[in-house]
């Protein structure tokens, strides 16, 4: 599986998932978020080449007829496979408020 | 420049719910909480809750017993607040606003230029 | 919920002399070394504008004749060498609870 246990063990320049740290404050400007501070939000990227995790029959056949011309545009694209939540604390006033982003951390890439 | 346009006057029946648009641009829209204010004629101002459109997390006014609804769509920048079991004492202004960007809770800098709901049988 | 209460309700000045608007939270609006009271004025037929952000910090492009002060429980707007430009509702608001509140309203008026 292209997932992080994979990615971030080894030098892979196809499809995978890549580390991306995300500090709320810093690089998105959300002073508000009290808790965590940022996080690991992850991203795919890489060339999707024939059989590489395909995750459809059109991405294998996609895959397939851009190996055999390489001049094409037409590829599979790296995206995300399976996604994490998030949790985070705010405060509304004085009062904690605690919630659940779905789908905030990228685990895993495959090429569709 | 920061500009928040609303949606036009509106004139709705008792028990029946309103919808009014804020439409935001300048600014990038799912960095701030949007708030909205309401302000009946002739007096004050009142905070019925707000929204953060990166993902619609909501903080609601108790005063307006469930009554608002508010929700955000980010592909077109552009907030909405609907109210719903109107009556006649719902019959304002109302505006949105955006959050300064420190708290949640917070001032607000930059106002629609507001829309003005009557409730009338 | 937090009661804001303005004094005066209103009030005449004439140009060119202070003007002083008070502000009184039923309990405290300091929290984490900030006050959260904020000031607005709303000019007949517009939009309120934000003036003073966390008690006495100026908002940009309003005029230095603005200035605002006080902690806790009390605080002050004061304007100086007034204007007809001035006239309007000026409102005091804290977001150190929730909900949101604001105070009543002053009215400006020139003399």
């Known amino acids: 599986a292209l997932d992080t246990n994979y990615c971030f063990r080894n030098l892979e320049e196809n499809c995978c998932v890549r580390p991306l740290y995300i500090d709320f404050r810093q690089d998105l400007g959300w002073k508000w978020v009290h808790e965590p501070k940022g996080y690991y939000a992850n991203f795919c990227s890489g060339p999707c080449p024939y059989l590489r995790s395909a995750d459809t029959t059109h991405s294998t056949v996609l895959g397939l007829y851009n190996t055999l011309n390489p001049e094409a545009s037409a590829s599979p694209c790296c995206v995300p496979q399976d996604l994490e939540p998030l949790t985070i604390l705010y405060y509304v006033g004085r009062t904690p408020k605690v919630e659940q982003l779905s789908n905030m951390v990228v685990k895993s890439c495959k090429c569709s | 420049e920061v500009q928040l346009v609303q949606s036009g006057a509106e004139v709705k029946k008792p028990g029946a719910s309103v919808k009014v648009s804020c439409k935001t641009s300048?600014?990038?829209?799912?960095?701030?909480?949007m708030n909205w204010v309401r302000q009946a004629p002739g007096a004050g101002l009142d905070w019925m809750g707000q929204?953060?459109?990166?993902?619609?997390?909501?903080n609601y006014n108790e005063m307006f017993e469930g009554r608002v609804t508010l929700t955000a769509d980010t592909s077109t920048s552009t907030a909405y607040m609907e109210l719903s079991s109107l009556r006649a004492g719902d019959i304002a202004v109302y505006y949105c606003?955006?959050?300064?960007?420190?708290?949640?809770?917070?001032?607000?800098?930059?106002w629609g230029q507001g829309t003005l709901v009557t409730v009338s049988s | 919920d937090i009661v804001m209460t303005q004094t005066p309700p209103s009030l005449s000045v004439s140009p060119r002399e202070t003007a002083s608007i008070s502000c009184r939270a039923s309990?405290?609006?300091?929290?984490?070394?900030?006050?959260?009271m904020h000031w607005y004025l709303q000019k007949p037929g517009q939009s309120p504008q934000l003036l003073i952000y966390?008690?006495?910090n100026l908002e940009s492009g309003v005029s230095d004749r603005f200035s605002g002060s006080g902690s806790g429980t009390d605080f002050t707007l004061r304007i100086s060498r007034v204007e007809a430009n001035d006239t309007g509702v000026y409102y005091c608001?804290?977001?150190?609870?929730?909900?949101?509140?604001f105070g009543q309203g002053t009215k400006l008026e020139l003399k």
């Open positions: 309990e405290s609006v300091d929290s984490y070394g900030n006050s959260f």
């Open positions: 300048g600014y990038t829209f799912i960095k701030y909480w």
């Open positions: 929204i953060f459109p990166a993902w619609g997390s909501t």
């Open positions: 606003a955006r959050g300064y960007g420190n708290y949640a809770l917070d001032a607000m800098d930059y």
């Open positions: 608001q804290q977001n150190n609870e929730d909900p949101l509140t």
């Open positions: 966390l008690a006495s």
